[in-house]
Each structure stands twice: as structure tokens, then as C-alpha cells.
Amino acid sequence: QFELEILSMQNVNGELQNGNCCGGARNPGDRKCTRDECDTYFKVCLKEYQSRVTAGGPCSFGSGSTPVIGGNTFNLKASRGNDRNRIVLPFSFAWPRSYTLLVEAWDSSNDTVQPDSIIEKASHSGMINPSRQWQTLKQNTGVAHFEYQIRVTCDDYYYGFGCNKFCRPRDDFFGHYACDQNGNKTCMEGWMGPECNRAICRQGCSPKHGSCKLPGDCRCQYGWQGLYCDKCIPHPGCVHGICNEPWQCLCETNWGGQLCDKDLNYCGTHQPCLNGGTCSNTGPDKYQCSCPEGYSGPNCEIAEHACLSDPCHNRGSCKETSLGFECECSPGWTGPTCSTNIDDCSPNNCSHGGTCQDLVNGFKCVCPPQWTGKTCQLDANECEAKPCVNAKSCKNLIASYYCDCLPGWMGQNCDININDCLGQCQNDASCRDLVNGYRCICPPGYAGDHCERDIDECASNPCLNGGHCQNEINRFQCLCPTGFSGNLCQLDIDYCEPNPCQNGAQCYNRASDYFCKCPEDYEGKNCSHLKDHCRTTPCEVIDSCTVAMASNDTPEGVRYISSNVCGPHGKCKSQSGGKFTCDCNKGFTGTYCHENINDCESNPCRNGGTCIDGVNSYKCICSDGWEGAYCETNINDCSQNPCHNGGTCRDLVNDFYCDCKNGWKGKTCHSRDSQCDEATCNNGGTCYDEGDAFKCMCPGGWEGTTCNIARNSSCLPNPCHNGGTCVVNGESFTCVCKEGWEGPICAQNTNDCSPHPCYNSGTCVDGDNWYRCECAPGFAGPDCR
């Protein structure tokens, strides 16, 4: 919608455009309008852009009017929230940005017969982008002057310069997104796609064999399994086999058969041949043993000379018998081949909870700390291990010991420092526990063993110049006598700081006051009043730039006053016929030296740098990744050695690339398993792991491999008015305005009439980076002097 708000109206005489009075006749004496005031209301007509405005024709973008909002003169700038002075024109089309606006002030006749009369009309053709900011416009010619402000705002959920980009956030089955400030959909975490209705699967989920319908999920296709659906399912019943594709059963070495369950190397797997027999594989799950002499049987398990193979272990002696052999075991061993160690811990002979360890033909007791001896029957002397830390002595007891602690210590081993801090410290002091004692650490301003004493900071008489010292906690205060100040009354008060004297007057400090020595033209306590020389001395016009005035301050008795028409950047030069010209300082041009020469004309900034014009100088604001006076140097982004684990760094524009070694991955070769981390993509970009590389999806306003380069789009088309320079600032922009303009998009004309440059009650007319003085009767010159 297009909004217009009337701010003020000045119709000093209460006149209409045709010169008549709003109500009633003129006063014959001063020709001013008498009787009642104008009943002012406004009409607005908004239409397509016209370079030459025509008053007629339809208001194709809309029209409206206010009720009567005031009389001849009124100011509504302070009355916020008053809708009477506001006209709202809704539009259902794309806002074209350029427009023509006709604003008319009317006098209501309050009469059905008498028609309303026009007071003043203003027309304005321009371009305005949707914004919450108001743009102020003025009608300063004709019988009435009025001021109004306009703006265009987009309806909710509409964006862009034309208010024709629609985006409404949603978070349901059909989409999961918010809208950025340009009306682009920004997907919520876990969602992607133009409508943000495609789930982002678990990182690492196989794009070929896995999929998901909810974020973070990874659902496997038929025949695939695993957390990432990257493992095939082998044929059911496959024993010693693997698969490359689902339902395969590819046998491991030495296995065969449909299910890889047939052992092709029975000899290697089972080693069935005993007594030095040689094994041969004869087929799947089949083998044959060839036995050494004296052995037989399928596994060479039958000994033909039983004692030949030394069957009796652990130094047992062998005797051949009719059934084979018999072993006579050495002490501590038993069993048919003497291979079983007799358990000497049965029954357990260890006392006092000792643990019995069986040895060959014997046992050993592992005793608890308080006992010793072969069967833990003896009391151990614990004092031998010196367990007492801070003690006078150690006493051995049956199955225990006792430490006689030194003062301040406690615990079985006298290793616990008794806490002697029991709240003795006062005034919020902290207590430090010592051995058999404590120490109070006092807060500033307190002293004493328990911080019970307030330190008298006045004891050293710190106050100077007769100041009275007042003791406070951890500080003192000096009450200073008149004429002195400072925390120690060390300063004689300087009434000249800050300088109260105006117009270049010299300030002199006194004991309790100051005195301003005024220059000749000024008077008053602070030299703020201009002396009216014309009460006493007549002025004589010397030329178009100078007037002479009688003065006691110069030897000749005459003082020359120069015109300031050429402003701060030029000197006035008198020409014949009452004319003048301005000699401009370096860097300025124009009739009044009011234009700053554009030093950026030659486009000196390289590599996309933005040139900011200065006075007889310029400055380059470089694009990301460039530096130097002309943005000619590519910043070395490898200077900080960002690549880890032996990676090689290659410098790019505002970026770097790491060539990783030995299976390292990621932007900085920092990871074994992922190309992405939270720092890979800059400026809110989303990182996608693409196996041997990463990819950044950049938000609006950013581009480049890691979203490190600001797009110029926020400066296209140039949003800065009146020759302002646009500087890209991420997704937004900043305007650097030319002299004479201000505001976020350089749309506001700087008030060149501030501070008052026109003398002798002259009226100042503000222009675009210039002003003009309209002099009061009896005065002349560019500044009415």
C-alpha cells in the first residue's frame, strides 16, 4: 500500500491559490485576510510516472482525501497515531517503483451550494522502493507551504521492490520453511528442495540403496542393510561367504559349496592327524592321514608300541601293558597321562581369609594386608609400610594399626587437614584453612586478624587545597572548597572547559567564574549576540564581495567584512556590474564551490572494489579477498597454514583449497570420515558431503565454493539515490552519500541552512547542497550583510 501523511501547513495569510481569502474580505489597512481561517483538507492522486506531469487524467494507482485537519497553519509532526492526516492507497498490482503524485490542499466551504476551493497544489514524480522508512517531501512555492511524507509498504507475506514475490512460512506435510528478508524460502533443519518438503537423510546414507521420508532417517532398499544401507544382504544360510550384490554367497578362501559351508582345507582347519601323521585334503570336508611307523587308525591315533611316543607327561614313567601303557606319575600329578595337577588347595589351609594358589605338589597363600606367614596365621606389622602421614607415632595392633596425629590433622592415616574455618572472619572476608589454624583474607577497606577493623583511608591526609576528608569503606571522599575540584581537590575549576565562549572569543578563567573577550562583531556574556553596527556606524558596499564598516579596532578606522557566499570551500572574487565568481579550493567546483569533484570517475578500484569519493581523494572498499589502495592484491588465505595432516594449501579469492593426503578429508583435511563440519561453509551455507569433495548450498546474497563471496545483488539496481555509492554488506547494503544528501538511501537533502547563514533576519532557502538568502527589506548581498 502507498501511504501519505500530512506533516505541516503554512498559509500565513489564509489565502487561496487564486489570491482570494479563504473566508471573508481583506483588511483595507494591511491587506491581510480577516474573519475565519481556511478549513484545510488534502486530496491525493497517484498515477503512473510522468516526466511532464499532467493534472488531468485518471489516478490510475488510486486516489483519496483527508477530512479537514486544520486551519491556515498547523504542525502535525508530533501527533503520531492520528489517522486523520493519513491517506492509505492500497494496490493489488505489482508496485512499479516509479510514480507521479499530485497533492492538493483545499479549503472546505462547509456549504452545499458553495464549492470547495483549492489552496495549493504540489506534484512529484519519482521512484520509491517498499520500506518502513518515510520519505519527506515539501511544497515550498505559492501561497501556502506544506510538508508531507510518503512510503510504500508490502502486505504481509509479500516481498521485493514490486511487492509481488509471495512467501508465507509453513511447517507441515506440504513444506517446512521460513522466509528470508527477500521472500526466498529457507528450509528448516532437516529439509531440502524448492518447497522444503524433501527430507535430508542421515549423513552417509547411500544415495543409491537408501532413502528417507523423515530427516535423519536411512531406509534400505530390498537386499541392503546397515546404518547407511551400504551393506548387501548375502544369500540366506551363507556360512563362510560374503556378497558384493544382494543375495550372493561368494566363498571365503578354503570354503566351497552353494552356501560356502564345505571345508576345502579340512587338514588346515581341524589338523586331525595325530602322532606326526601327514594330512592330505581329498575333497570338500574329506581328508586322509598317512601315519608314521608304529601308528595306525584313520587319525593315526592307535600306537602299536605304546610307550614309544612318551605318553606320560610331567616326568611320569611309562610301562607297556597288554591294553597299551600305564603311567606312574611324579609327586603332584595324576591322571592316565600324568597331565592333571593335584589340587593342593583342597582343603584350603589359608587362615584369616587368605587366598590359596595351587602349585605343583604344594600351595601358596595370598594374605590380606593385616596377616602374614605360610598360612596367614601371623599378625603383620602395618607400621613397617609407614602409613601415618602427619603423625607423632604409629602403633601396631592385631590386624590393624593406630596413627597418633599431629595437631590440625585427622583420619586413619592423619592425612586429612582439620578445617579450622568456622566463621571467624568478618565483613565478607574469605577464610583460608591452614594446618592447625586459619587466615582471614580481608576485602578491600578492612584489616585485623578477623577483618574486624575498617581501615581509615583519611589517615594519610590525601585531600589537597583545604579539602575535608571523609572516611568510607575502602575509599575516601574529598569535600572541596569553592574553586577546586577533582578526587583530591587538586584541580582549580576551569570554567573555560568546555569553552562557553562563542564565535571564536577567547575565554579567561577566574576564581569562580569566566570572562569572554568578544571579537568586534559580537557581544553578550558568551559573545553570542551579533552587534548591530548599523545603530552606530553606517556600512559601505565596496564591491560584490566586501562591505566596509567604521571601526575603532583598525588603524584606518575602517573594517572590511568579506561575503561567505562561496561557502567553506571557496573565496569570493568581485566582478564588474555587481557580479562575483568563486575561486574553489582543490577538489571542489560549481558556482558556489558546493560540489565535490567526483574523484571516482576513472574507476580506479579493481577486482570489484567500490570507490568512495572524498575531497580531492578517493578510497577503495575492496571486495572480500582483495586488499591494497586499488584492491589490486589477492589476500593470501594460506598464510595461516589452514591445511592439517600434511595437506597442501592453494590460495583462491577470499578462500583456499586444501589438497589432502593419506585419506584425510574436509575443508582443512581435519577429518577421517566426513567432508563437512560447521565451519566448512561460511555465512549460513549448508554443507553436503559428496564422498571425495564437499558442496556448499549458499543462502541469498552469497556465492563461491564456501559461500565466501558476497553477491552484488543487494546493490543491483543501485538503491542509493542522488549519486550515492552502494557498498555490498552481506545480504544487505550501505549507502555512502554524496555531499548534501543523507539518510539510509541518500534520499534526504541535508539542511544547508543550518546553522543560519543569512544575516539581518534574511530567510534561508535550502537547495540540493546549496542555499540562497532572501533578504529582509533594506538588506542585500549573498548573505544579506
Epitope: R168, R170, D172, F173, F174, G175, E195, N197, A199, K213, L214
Partner: antibody, heavy 119, light 110 residues
Framework: QVQLVQSGAEVQKPGASVKVSCKVS????????IHWVRQAPGKGLEWMGG????????VYAQKFQDRVSMTQDTSTDTAYLQLSSLTSGDTALYYC????????????WGQGTLVTVSS | QAGLTQPPSASGTPGQRVTISCSGS????????VNWYQRLPGTAPKLVVY???QRPSGVPDRFSGSKSGTSASLVISGLQSEDEADYYC???????????FGGGTQLTVL
């Protein structure tokens, strides 16, 4: 105010097709997302499909995918449901409904069309 | 399709408070909002609660909804005779890629 008016009752033989219409008034069809829901006698409500406002295409319930077609005639602001290969199990009340403009619920329903499949 | 599970029937006397439950899974109620429809005999369904707990204008404030995890509830406090109807819960399902309705609960006012 949106109004949905459906066509009258139909009797069809098994194996035949049926086409039910839903006329929109108060809004244009292109401003709405029309969906179809049915209810067999003694059974609950069953969603058949409808227009996805974000992807701009019609989505069907997996159960009906092979034999349902939903079309729209924007010149007459009428939506159609066509169901083929009818069986007695398709005897039901068929409703058209509008999906709320910024939500996932149905805020307006037609009065329903009874389709009877009988030999 | 498993759908959403509702008790087949519920009842209460005028003025009483009645709760109808609806249980689903992570792919429907767990990740989407729940809507409730009332079907009076011989009429088209009518929305009584949307987005888990919002009431359309014109629906009395004795109807309220809630959701927790993969379950949802419709509460009718101060039961009235005109509330006698079938009530259906509904939620969109990511696995089914469509809308699921509960089997419906027949509410009787005794």
C-alpha cells in the same frame, strides 16, 4: 464464502467407471486445493488424493493409484473424481473437500455423492 | 497400512467430560499436526480441532485437543446431547505419502 456442490447419486456395475463432479463457488478453483475422501457403509473416512499446493500437482493415495484420476476444469470451476474397475467394495459416500489455504486440514466439505456398485 | 488407532466407542452423561484418544507413529502424529473431524448422522464431516489444539471459529470452547509424542486426544468437557456423533482424528503420513484417518469413535450421550 466457499461452497462445494457435488453431482447426484450413481449406480454402476462391477468393472465399470464412475465420474463424480464438485462445483466450486465463492472462490475460483485455481485459488483452492481440492481433495477427495470416501466413507463406505459402516466404515471410517478414507483419503483418496488431492492437489498439493506447494508442488502444484495432484497426489494419490497408494491404494487407489492405479485406478483413480482427479482432474480440474478451471473454466467452469469444477473438480472431477474418476474411479475405474469398480467392485462392490467401492460402494461409498464420496466427498470433495478444500484444504485450508495455509494448513493441512479440510475446512469446507461437499454434501457427498453416494456411489453404489451392484450387478 | 496401519493407520491411526481410535477406540470404537465412547460415552458419557450430559455435563460430563469425555476424552477420545488417537495413537499413531513417528511418521504421522510424531512428525505432523493432528486434526479432528465430527460427523453428525446424515451430514458431511466438520472440522472441530486443527493443528493439535486450535479451534475453528463457531466451534464451542468445550472442544479441546492436545498432542504428545505419537498420540493425540480430543476432550469434550460439559458434554451435550448435540455432541452425539462420530469423531475422526487425521494426520498426514510421510511413509504413506498421504493423509491417514483414525477408524472413528462413536460418541453416545447417555
Amino acid at each position: 464464502q466457499v461452497q462445494l456442490v457435488q453431482s447426484g447419486a450413481e449406480v454402476q456395475k462391477p468393472g465399470a467407471s464412475v465420474k463424480v463432479s464438485c462445483k466450486v463457488s465463492g472462490y475460483t478453483l485455481s485459488e483452492l486445493s481440492i481433495h477427495w475422501v470416501r466413507q463406505a457403509p459402516g466404515k471410517g473416512l478414507e483419503w483418496m488424493g488431492g492437489f498439493d499446493p506447494e508442488d502444484g500437482k495432484i497426489v494419490y493415495a497408494q491404494k487407489f493409484q492405479d485406478r483413480v484420476s482427479m482432474t480440474q476444469d478451471t473454466s467452469t470451476d469444477t473438480a472431477y473424481l474418476q474411479l475405474s474397475s469398480l467392485t462392490s467394495g467401492d460402494t461409498a459416500l464420496y466427498y470433495c473437500a478444500t484444504l485450508a489455504q495455509w494448513g493441512d486440514w479440510f475446512d469446507r466439505w461437499g454434501q457427498g455423492t453416494l456411489v453404489t456398485v451392484s450387478s | 497400512q496401519a493407520g491411526l488407532t481410535q477406540p470404537p466407542s465412547a460415552s458419557g452423561t450430559p455435563g460430563q467430560r469425555v476424552t477420545i484418544s488417537c495413537s499413531g507413529s513417528s511418521s504421522n502424529i510424531g512428525s505432523n499436526t493432528v486434526n479432528w473431524y465430527q460427523r453428525l448422522p446424515g451430514t458431511a464431516p466438520k472440522l472441530v480441532v486443527y493443528s493439535n489444539n486450535q479451534r475453528p471459529s463457531g466451534v464451542p470452547d468445550r472442544f479441546s485437543g492436545s498432542k504428545s509424542g505419537t498420540s493425540a486426544s480430543l476432550v469434550i468437557s460439559g458434554l451435550q446431547s448435540e455432541d452425539e456423533a462420530d469423531y475422526y482424528c487425521a494426520a498426514w503420513d510421510y511413509d504413506e505419502e498421504g493423509l491417514l484417518f483414525g477408524g472413528g469413535t462413536q460418541l453416545t450421550v447417555l
